[in-house]
Amino acid sequence: EQAPGTAPCSRGSSWSADLDKCMDCASCRARPHSDFCLGCAAAPPAPFRLLWP
């Protein structure tokens, strides 16, 4: 997830200063030191699921 209102990027992406465009935050898992990863916020917690026997 990206930080709130990451301009001018859509949800799940962050602006790259070097490329001057939005990049997918998912790629930060493989390349965490890319510049735009600074703008990718912590992933939201997984939704709670009730486990039935």
Epitope: Q2, A3, P4, G5, T6, A7, S14, W15, A17, D18, D20, C28, P32, H33, S34, D35, C37, L38, G39, C40, A41, A42, A43
Partner: antibody
């Protein structure tokens, strides 16, 4: 209200270590990158390090790489800077700051600053 | 990032024009104001957008390697040091600063 409160500065001998802390309140800490910036006496601003909201991405100025470590404890809403192998030239006021990705990585909230003096 | 001039001596009511030049092309730039004994304050982000609560006498412009901060009419509280800042190659960098002083 949104604020950053710093602690941990002081006098340390060359080669010594120190850990700075920055406690955040008034905003969703995990949603923001954070940074450390320093200012030597009578000098300009120098960026030191930055970390993403998750803590998974870290960035350092060449002058501190390998000596300083930035980290964050998101459940405690706290940012840290572990400073090792300190040198006289690390003497400065250290500021923590919130980095706004939606402000194209401008820093919009700053701590009050804490003085680190490296001297024998 | 190279800022010029190092010091600008002006009177209240005058226009201040501060320059920031990058060695390589920069896509966006921020500007900060700092007064003695205080933390910096964000004025301009994304080259030309004013941060929250910043009066409209402050404006930013520029592209590529040349950027400008303009204060249209200096107020007494505007006399301070101003820094530009970029983010490039995964490094945040500040300019050396411009001091705006009362002549």
């Amino acid at each position: 209200q949104v604020q950053l409160v710093q602690s941990g500065g002081g006098l340390v001998k060359p080669g010594g270590s120190l850990r700075l802390s920055c406690a955040a309140s008034g905003f969703t800490f995990t949603s923001y990158a954070m940074s450390w910036v320093r200012q030597a006496p009578g000098k300009g601003l120098e960026w030191v390090s930055a970390i993403s909201g998750s803590g998974g991405s870290t960035y350092y100025a060449d002058s501190v790489k390998g000596r300083f470590t930035i980290s964050r404890d998101n459940p405690k809403n706290t940012l840290y800077l572990q400073m090792n192998s300190l040198r006289a030239e690390d003497t400065a006021v250290y500021y923590c700051a919130r980095v706004r990705a939606n402000y194209y990585y401008g820093m919009d909230v700053w701590g009050q600053g804490t003085l680190v003096t490296v001297s024998s | 990032l190279t800022q010029s001039p190092g010091t600008l001596s002006l009177s209240p009511g005058e226009r201040a024009t501060l320059s920031c030049r990058a060695s390589q092309s920069v896509s966006r730039l921020a500007w900060y104001q700092q007064k003695p004994g205080q933390a910096p304050r964000l004025l301009i982000y994304g080259t030309s957008s004013r941060a929250t609560g910043i009066p409209d006498r402050f404006s930013g412009s520029g592209s590529g390697t040349d950027f400008t901060l303009t204060i249209s009419r200096l107020e007494p509280e505007d006399f301070a040091v101003y820094y530009c800042q970029q983010f490039r190659n995964s490094l945040l960098t500040f300019g050396g600063g411009t001091k705006v002083e009362i002549t």
